[in-house]
């Protein structure tokens, strides 16, 4: 049992200079049609330097980013560096902790879409300028005190009963997602994230739709409806273009098939 | 009504088990973190350690560790704490509380009497 | 280890009189805080959570504040059904009670 919370304190516990950063555990709550995206991070936030495909981390590279800062800055220690794999064509997974840790926050690539006023926010580091050959998706590990905000996905409008906001936080030892006052219905409309929102306390999730740490001797099975959820991107026009041009070429493909097999028909009422 | 219900007074020897149940009713057992709580005679309160209903996950305070286990059975909505190599400084009364509103504790099980003497 | 130290031990006061419980946490521990009273035989009762939300039910005269790491109850006139124990707890990290303030009739 002491291994256990040796191994367990030294997973949690970051040291950041002039204080502990607490890792969350788990991601923030998955709501059906929604996205999210924090608009600053943390100190002690640590970001995988994760390399695309056919890439690796340069040799004494860095595993990951830290978000770190005194009382007046914060900045990203470390650089992420990749270089190209000579070697097998695969994408090493890099994580500060062991995999069985569910520590995982992925977020999609994109170009830093980031509001002003974050930049000034103290504690807090803006979203990292991307690197060459990243990985098209972002590994995050927040830790207590992050505020991610919802928005849903395109073609689904938001319903507000509360803040489509989540903040990880800690109580009895334990640290938990708040779950964010936001459902997405199927109508053409989108929500923006917030520019500039101050933060308010979301009302309690409760463990079917949160996470523990320590002594846990179950993983928690979040509960919520999972159906049609996307993952925790952020959909860039990139991206949307990319999924147009996967569509028409869909269309295209079905279309071209249907006339081979018309083609076929009639050849074949032909040869009887 | 929302309420938590315990199991009667217990008198054990020295180095022997007990096993303490709280049923609870009037709202999702599996919804709510389930806290145990002792209380010496004329002392304070003591947290023993927490279990998540819906996954049976548990957490104790490193006091009780390799000494409380904490399980539950959600089809009849009860929740256990057992306390073995049970000592004289373990008689008290032991409390369920449910992790409530703000993460406090805001029902308790009215109390289970442990008195362990030789 | 988070130490939370309750105080005074024991409160002698009469029925309509303020009376303020102190509660200092050892380091921080945001607004994670509640107090509960307690009856002699009986569970302890919810009454402030998060530092200064007033459980629904709990009479007004009841409120909690913060300052930093210090956390005061106060009772803004006391009435017979108040003379109780009261207990601190911080649940930021794990579970931490005070040792508990008696009033007691003066």
């Known amino acids: 049992m002491d291994s256990y919370l040796l191994m367990w304190g030294l997973l949690t516990f970051i040291m950041v200079p002039g204080c502990q950063a607490e890792l969350c555990d788990d991601d923030p709550p998955e709501i059906p049609h929604a996205t999210f995206k924090a608009m600053a991070y943390k100190e002690g936030t640590m970001l995988n330097c994760e390399c695309k495909r056919g890439f690796r981390r340069i040799k004494s590279g860095s595993l990951y980013m830290l978000c770190t800062g005194n009382s007046s800055h914060s900045s990203w220690d470390n650089q992420c560096q990749c270089t190209s794999s000579a070697t097998r064509n695969t994408t090493k997974q890099v994580t500060p902790q062991p995999e069985e840790q569910k520590e995982r926050k992925t977020t999609e690539m994109q170009s830093p879409m980031q509001p002003v006023d974050q930049a000034s926010l103290p504690g807090h580091c803006r979203e990292p300028p991307p690197w060459e050959n990243e990985a098209t998706e972002r590994i995050y590990h927040f830790v207590v005190g992050q505020m991610v905000y919802y928005q849903c996905v395109q073609g689904y409008r938001a319903l507000h009963r509360g803040p489509a906001e989540s903040v990880c936080k800690m109580t009895h030892g334990k640290t938990r997602w708040t779950q964010p006052q936001l459902i997405c219905t199927g109508e053409m409309e989108t929500s923006q994230f917030p520019g500039e929102e101050k933060p308010q306390a979301s009302p309690e999730g409760r463990p079917e739709s949160e996470t523990s740490c320590l002594v846990t001797t179950t993983d928690f099975q979040i509960q919520t409806e999972m159906a049609a959820t996307m993952e925790t991107s952020i959909f860039t026009t990139e991206y949307q273009v990319a999924v147009a041009g996967c569509v028409f070429l869909l269309i295209s493909v079905l279309l071209l098939s249907g006339l081979t097999w018309q083609r076929r028909q009639r050849k074949s009422r032909r040869t009887i | 009504q929302v309420q938590l219900v315990q199991s009667g007074a217990e008198v054990k020897k020295p180095g022997a088990s007990v096993k303490v149940s709280c049923k609870a009713s009037g709202y999702t057992f599996t919804g709510y973190y389930m806290h145990w709580v002792r209380q010496a005679p004329g002392q304070g309160l003591e947290w023993m350690g927490w279990i998540n209903p819906n996954s049976g996950g548990t957490n104790s305070a490193q006091k009780f560790q390799g000494r409380v286990t904490m399980t539950r059975d959600t089809s009849i909505n009860t929740a256990y704490m057992e306390l073995s190599r049970l000592r004289s400084d373990d008689t008290a009364v032991y409390y369920c509380?449910?992790?409530?509103?703000?993460?406090?504790?805001?029902?308790w099980g009215q109390g289970t009497m442990v008195t362990v003497s030789s | 280890d988070f130490q939370m130290t309750q105080s005074p031990s024991t409160l002698s006061a009469s029925v309509g009189d303020r009376v303020t419980i102190t509660c200092r946490a050892s380091?921080?521990?945001?607004?994670?805080l509640a107090w509960y009273q307690q009856k002699p035989g009986k569970a302890p009762k919810l009454l402030i959570y998060e530092a200064s939300s007033l459980k629904s039910g709990v009479p007004s005269r009841f409120s909690g504040s913060e300052s930093g790491t210090e956390f005061t109850l106060t009772i803004s006139s006391l009435q017979p059904d108040d003379f109780a124990t009261y207990y601190c707890h911080q649940y930021n990290s794990y579970s931490t009670f005070g040792q508990g303030t008696k009033v007691e009739i003066k």
């Open positions: 509380a449910r992790e409530g509103e703000g993460d406090a504790f805001d029902i």
């Open positions: 380091q921080s521990i945001s607004s994670w």
